[in-house]
């Protein structure tokens, strides 16, 4: 079943290559287990950046080596992606799945364009 997912159109990463955006979903029911996946679309190719399953009211748990972290509040997830470089500029799509209890719902956002600028190298100090 389809579900509406909203996310901002554009976000700027900071000089350390960290970008954050909000992913909001219109939950049709009272889900207790939610899965959030971040996908990156570039040149018509879609790749998975990270994913986390969480129980409502608990923290999002990404894999230890994940570049993503996140927090949840109600039907809203705040996602942070770290270690981004200029080549990572692209459209980051939020996919939300309500895993439990049934029925299963899935929604995909329109995507957030994250702009990343590589920091200027520090000049050598004498």
């Amino acid at each position: 079943k389809a579900m509406h997912v909203a996310q901002p159109a554009v976000v700027l990463a900071n000089s350390r290559g960290t970008a954050s955006f909000v992913c909001e979903y219109a939950s049709p029911g009272k889900a207790t287990e939610v899965r959030v996946t971040v996908l990156r679309q570039a040149d018509s190719q879609v790749t998975e950046v990270c994913a986390a399953t969480y129980m409502m009211g608990n923290e999002l748990t990404f894999l230890d080596d994940s570049i993503c972290t996140g927090t949840s509040s109600g039907n809203q997830v705040n996602l942070t992606i770290q270690g981004l470089r200029a080549m990572d500029t692209g459209l980051y799509i939020c996919k939300v799945e309500l895993m439990y209890p049934p029925p299963y719902y899935m929604g995909i956002g329109n995507g957030t364009q994250i702009y990343v600028i590589d920091p200027e190298p520090c000049p050598d100090s004498d």
Partner: antibody, heavy 115, light 110 residues
Framework: QVQLVESGAEVKKPGASVKVSCKAS????????MNWVRQAPGQGLEWIGL????????NYAQKFQGRVTFTVDTSISTAYMELSRLRSDDTGVYFC????????WGQGTLVTVSA | QAVVTQEPSLTVSPGGTVTLTCGSS?????????PNWVQQKPGQAPRSLIG???NKASWTPARFSGSLLGGKAALTISGAQPEDEAEYYC?????????FGGGTKLTVLR
């Protein structure tokens, strides 16, 4: 519902500074970039710049670089635009706007620069 | 910096259909430019009609629709009404900044 409410009209002398506020409500303030747009009398819309309230990242249009500063107070969901070294051609209406998949505009703040 | 181009003025008869376009000096407009269409009437603040190519605001009448047409963003009004007479601006996103077009003055013939 989403609302952007701006501060009242200002009259300033050339060389002075002006600070306009924009109070946001009805959405996650830190989740969306806030833009500032100027409209001179009888003219079109001109993008001044934007701020990312979550991490305070700003990007200013080249024309305004060095004269404009954007700040936010996330505790009261308010964005600010300060324009310094005002000139008579800075006279106009200043709008805050959330430009997005669904966009919203403030009602505008008239800034008059006159000796 | 990119230049965004719009028709300076267009005229439509009541009940007629008109298409306003928004072009980019850098090439074809795509969904990555998140085309925004804004309506402004004299003495009023701008009001967003369409965001991100074709997402309507809750107050946007059904007769307005956004699309990409021949490398440009387009706003089509099907069945124009007298109250649609206004200035229409488009805004395009370029990686880290927005650029506004010069606006199209739409006249609805009385």
């Amino acid at each position: 519902q989403v609302q952007l409410v701006e501060s009242g009209a200002e009259v300033k002398k050339p060389g002075a500074s002006v600070k306009v506020s924009c109070k946001a409500s009805g959405y996650s303030f830190t989740g969306y970039t806030m833009n500032w747009v100027r409209q001179a009398p009888g003219q079109g819309l001109e993008w001044i710049g934007l701020i990312n309230p979550y991490n305070n990242i700003t990007n200013y249009a080249q024309k305004f670089q060095g004269r404009v500063t954007f700040t936010v107070d996330t505790s009261i969901s308010t964005a600010y635009m300060e324009l310094s070294r005002l000139r008579s051609d800075d006279t106009g209406v200043y709008f805050c706007a959330r430009l997005d998949y669904r966009s919203y505009w403030g009602q505008g703040t008239l800034v008059t620069v006159s000796a | 910096q990119a230049v965004v181009t719009q028709e300076p003025s267009l005229t439509v008869s009541p009940g007629g259909t008109v298409t306003l376009t928004c072009g980019s000096s850098t090439g074809a407009v795509t969904t990555s430019n998140f085309p925004n269409w804004v309506q402004q009437k004299p003495g009023q603040a701008p009001r967003s009609l369409i965001g991100g190519t074709n997402n309507k605001a809750s107050w946007t009448p059904a007769r307005f629709s956004g699309s990409l047409l021949g490398g440009k963003a387009a706003l089509t009004i099907s069945g124009a009404q007298p109250e649609d007479e206004a200035e229409y601006y488009c805004a395009l996103w370029y990686s880290n900044h927005w650029v506004f077009g010069g606006g199209t003055k739409l006249t609805v013939l009385r």
